[in-house]
């Protein structure tokens, strides 16, 4: 495949990455799949600067990111190391709360209304953000 050098239509470029901000809601797994089908992934926040950029674009709305602990450890969808990486949890979070009564705990992370992170029930239909890196090999064939 060829290297992507500019962002697709309706995506926003920032620091050599492209971002797409949904305006509808999906469960975390469906949002994850949507991004993958776009040759992207749910947003992976690696710095305070990136946090502020995403926060500015999503506003005060619950929005999924590419972080979950459905199989035990917290994992970023692109393999970025959680333990050594950037974190921005709300106080008292993550708490894997069971009091919601929906069954199971809270295994998926989202931006809250103030931008800080919370873990929540993965089935909740929140907005989401896709991210793809510029200069990475695209799955699309090169234009002839």
């Amino acid at each position: 495949g060829s290297e992507r050098t500019c962002c697709p239509v309706n995506w926003v470029e920032h620091e050599r990455s492209c971002y797409w901000f949904s305006r509808s809601g999906k469960a975390w797994a469906d949002a994850d799949n949507y991004c993958r089908l776009e040759d992207a992934h749910l947003v992976v926040v690696t710095s305070w600067e990136e946090q502020k950029f995403v926060q500015h674009h999503i506003g005060p709305v619950n929005t999924w990111m590419g972080l979950h602990d459905q199989n035990g450890p917290w994992k970023w969808v692109d393999g970025t190391d959680y333990e050594t990486g950037f974190k921005n949890w709300r106080p008292e979070q993550p708490d894997d709360w069971y009091g919601h009564g929906l069954g199971g705990g809270e295994d998926c992370a989202h931006f809250t209304d103030d931008g800080r992170w919370n873990d929540d029930v993965c089935q909740r239909p929140y907005r989401w953000v896709c991210e793809t890196e510029l200069d990475k090999a695209s799955q699309e064939p090169p234009l002839l």
Partner: antibody, heavy 113, light 107 residues
Framework: EVQLLESGGGLVQPGGSLRLSCAAS????????MSWVRQAPGKGLEWVSA????????YYADSVKGRFTISRDNSKNTVYLQMNSLRAEDTAVYYC??????WGQGTLVTVSS | DIQMTQSPSSLSASVGDRVTITCRAS??????LAWFQQKPGKAPTSLIY???SLQSGVPSKFSGSGSGTDFTLTISSLQPEDFATYYC?????????FGPGTKVDIR
Amino acid sequence: EVQLLESGGGLVQPGGSLRLSCAASGFTFSSYVMSWVRQAPGKGLEWVSAMSGSGGHTYYADSVKGRFTISRDNSKNTVYLQMNSLRAEDTAVYYCVKHGYSWGQGTLVTVSS
Amino acid sequence: DIQMTQSPSSLSASVGDRVTITCRASQDINNYLAWFQQKPGKAPTSLIYASSSLQSGVPSKFSGSGSGTDFTLTISSLQPEDFATYYCQQYHSYPFTFGPGTKVDIR
């Protein structure tokens, strides 16, 4: 690498108390629920208690409610199980468990006169 | 509290056999079910979470299925290292509960 090291087990008389500790390393401790699960000699597994990462939520099995207290010190990466009013049926290997999936090697508690 | 039952309680099998263990919950737990393997004198290890998702590093000969109240763990071709006791656990709601276990031994 995740490591969970239980300590504090031993022989105690019925009615006595014991405090188990679990020292954790290799992960961001405050991000995870920590639990205790026990196994009586020759028997199956029994979930005992759990506490959320910040300590804001605690959960107990009916068999230990009012007698056992779970706590954690995130500055020390350690979770505790304070066991009071111990009974013979509390005799078991007690395992420390990270978010349901990673287990320590266990510490044996024997309640006997 | 949610009660968990397993069958059989024990089984004898030969290397290469396909083995199926069933687990039943007393009420609907969606797919909030995990399977653990325990060998004598050792701590349990995680095999499967969310009913059918294989834990990292677990060989693909293990598989899980089911939703609601009925679940199965299958070992497609039993190997010597698979002789152990297997437990299911629901994590739909507290207090979490385990099945009584299924001991798989050599025929």
